[in-house]
C-alpha cells in the first residue's frame, strides 16, 4: 500500500490579493479521523491552530481563517482573509496534520512560493509532481541534451565509430527534494493500544521544530513495548508552492477517534498520553 503522504499547497486568490487558500490532502489507505491546520509551524511545535476538521462532527476555525471545508473524503481547503495592508501570509508556513486510522498522524507544511502569480497555481494533484518552473527547465534541458546526443550519434555513425552510451538526463523528485528538505524517516513503537503508534517527530530541516510537549509524560507502559518496524517515508511530493514531509504520529498525539468507533474511543492529542485509552478532548 505504501507509506502515507500529505501534500500541502498554498494559493493566492487571483481576484483578491489579500485572500489565500491552503489546500491539503492525504494520500494513504486509512480513514481520516481529524485534520488540523496551523500556521507558523507544525501543530504542537510553535504553530498556531487555524482550523480543526472532523469528518463527521464538523469543523472549527479561528481568525484569520474564513472557511474550512472538506473538498473530498481525503482533502480539505482553508480560506484565509488577510485584513492587513501588507500580507503576512506570503512568508508564512502552513502545516496540515492528518490523523488517520490506523496509520497515525502525518504532518506536512508548505508556503506560498515567492514568485507566485495570483491564480496561476495548479490545482492540488494527488500524484507526485515537479514544480512547474523546474519541470520546464528540466524538460528543455532534456530536449537539448537529446538533440545534442542525436547529432553526436549521427556524426559518429558517419565516422563508423561505435555509438557511445549517453547518460540519460533525468532528475527525479527525490533528488530535487534532497536539495531543499531533509528526507524523512519515521519510526514506530507499539503501545498497549493496537491503534496507537509513537512517533519520532519529523519536520523539514528548514523549520525550527521540536518534539511536542509532554513526550516524557507518556504512560510508562509505552517504554517497554516491542519496537515496531521502522517506517521509511516515501518520496515527498513537490508541488508549486508546497512541500511535503511525513510523520507517523502517536495516534494519541493525532488525538482523534477512529472513525467507526464514536468519539469515546478516540485517543489522546498532543503526545501527552492516552486518556485511559479512550481519550478525546474538546476540539473545535
Amino acid at each position: 500500500a505504501g507509506t502515507p503522504e500529505v501534500w500541502v499547497q498554498v494559493q493566492m486568490e487571483a481576484t483578491e490579493l489579500s485572500s489565500f487558500t491552503v489546500h491539503c490532502g492525504f494520500l494513504g489507505p486509512g480513514s481520516i479521523s481529524l485534520v488540523t491546520v496551523s500556521w507558523g509551524g507544525p501543530d504542537g511545535a510553535g504553530g498556531t491552530k487555524l482550523a480543526v476538521l472532523h469528518p463527521e462532527l464538523g469543523t472549527r476555525q479561528w481568525a484569520p481563517a474564513r472557511q474550512a471545508r472538506w473538498e473530498t473524503q481525503s482533502s480539505i481547503s482553508l480560506a484565509l482573509e488577510d485584513s492587513g495592508a501588507s500580507s503576512p501570509f506570503a512568508n508564512t508556513t502552513f502545516c496540515c496534520k492528518f490523523a488517520s486510522f490506523p496509520e497515525g498522524s502525518w504532518e506536512s507544511c508548505g508556503s506560498l512560493p515567492p514568485s507566485s502569480d495570483p491564480g496561476l497555481s495548479a490545482p492540488p494533484t494527488p500524484v507526485p509532481i515537479l514544480r512547474a518552473d523546474l519541470a520546464g527547465i528540466l524538460g528543455l534541458s532534456g530536449v537539448l541534451l537529446f538533440g545534442c546526443g542525436y547529432l553526436l550519434h549521427l556524426l559518429r555513425r558517419q565516422k563508423h565509430r561505435p555509438t557511445p552510451r549517453l547518460q540519460p538526463s533525468h532528475t527525479n523528485s527525490q533528488a530535487l527534494t534532497a536539495q531543499a528538505w531533509a528526507p524523512s524517516q519515521a519510526s514506530q513503537a507499539a503501545l498497549h493500544d493496537p491503534y496507537a503508534t509513537i512517533n519520532t517527530s519529523f519536520c523539514p530541516a528548514t523549520l525550527d521544530t521540536a518534539h511536542p510537549n509532554g513526550w516524557a509524560s507518556l504512560p510508562t507502559h509505552a517504554a517497554h513495548q516491542p519496537q515496531g518496524p521502522a517506517a521509511s517515508a516515501s518520496t515527498p511530493i513537490l508541488a508549486r508552492g508546497s512541500f511535503v514531509s511525513v510523520e507517523n504520529g502517536l495516534y494519541t498525539q493525532a488525538g482523534e477517534r477512529p472513525p467507526h468507533t464514536g468519539p469515546g474511543l478516540t485517543l489522546f492529542p498532543d503526545c501527552r498520553g492516552p486518556r485511559a485509552l479512550e481519550g478525546r478532548f474538546g476540539v473545535r
Epitope: 509532554g214 486518556r275 481519550g279
Partner: antibody, heavy 114, light 113 residues
Framework: EVQLVQSGAEVKKPGSSVKVSCKAS????????IEWVRQAPGQGLEWIGE????????NYNEKFKGRVTFTADTSTNTAYMELSSLRSEDTAVYYC???????WGQGTLVTVSS | DIVMTQSPDSLAVSLGERATINCKSS????????????LAWYQQKPGQPPKLLIY???TRESGVPDRFSGSGSGTDFTLTISSLQAEDVAVYYC?????????FGQGTKLEIK
Amino acid sequence: EVQLVQSGAEVKKPGSSVKVSCKASGGTFSSFSIEWVRQAPGQGLEWIGEILPGSNSTNYNEKFKGRVTFTADTSTNTAYMELSSLRSEDTAVYYCSSYWFAYWGQGTLVTVSS
Amino acid sequence: DIVMTQSPDSLAVSLGERATINCKSSQSLLNSGNQKNYLAWYQQKPGQPPKLLIYGASTRESGVPDRFSGSGSGTDFTLTISSLQAEDVAVYYCQNAHSYPPTFGQGTKLEIK
C-alpha cells in the same frame, strides 16, 4: 475520563458582571476549544462562543459580542466566561463543553435579579 | 444563521413502542466534498447537561444504546428510538454542526404514554 467542572451558582444584580469558570481534567486542555452554551429556564440551548486555550483564539455568537469575554489559563487548565451588563433575561444555566459538545460541565446557574 | 426546527414539540409514546423526532434545517447540512451531513442529536434529562447521542446524522456516540438511530440528509433529519425505555424520557435536541454559529433546535419533549 475527561471532566469539566464549573464554578457554583451566582446571583447578580442587573448591570453587573459574572465570571464563570470551567476546570478541565483528564485531557490536553490547550489542544481543543472550550465552548460556552446557555439554557434559560424551560428553554433550549444557545451557543455563546468558544475559546481555544492554547492560543486564546475565540469565536463569539454575534448576539453576545461586546458583552462576553472568554479567557483561559493553561497553567490551571481553567477556562472562564465573563458576561457583563447583565439583564434579567441572562438568567440561565451556563454550560462549558468541549469536543463538538461531546463533553459537558455540570452547569452554573446565574440568576440576575434586582 | 441556520435555523433548526424540530417536530413535534412534545411526544408521548408507550414503553416498547417506536418514537420518532424530526428536525429540519433552513440550509443544507450536507457537505458536498465528503458527502457527510453535519447534524448531531442530544438527549437532556432534567437537571443534567445535554448528552451527545448521534453525530454525522447517523453515527452513534460510543456507549449509546443501539435502539437510538439517526437518519436523513440535506435539510431533513430523523432521530428514532426503536423501542422506548423508561430511561429515555428526556428532551431531545438536534444541532447544526455544519457552520458557524452552532445552532440547536428548540427541543422535543419525549414522555411515556
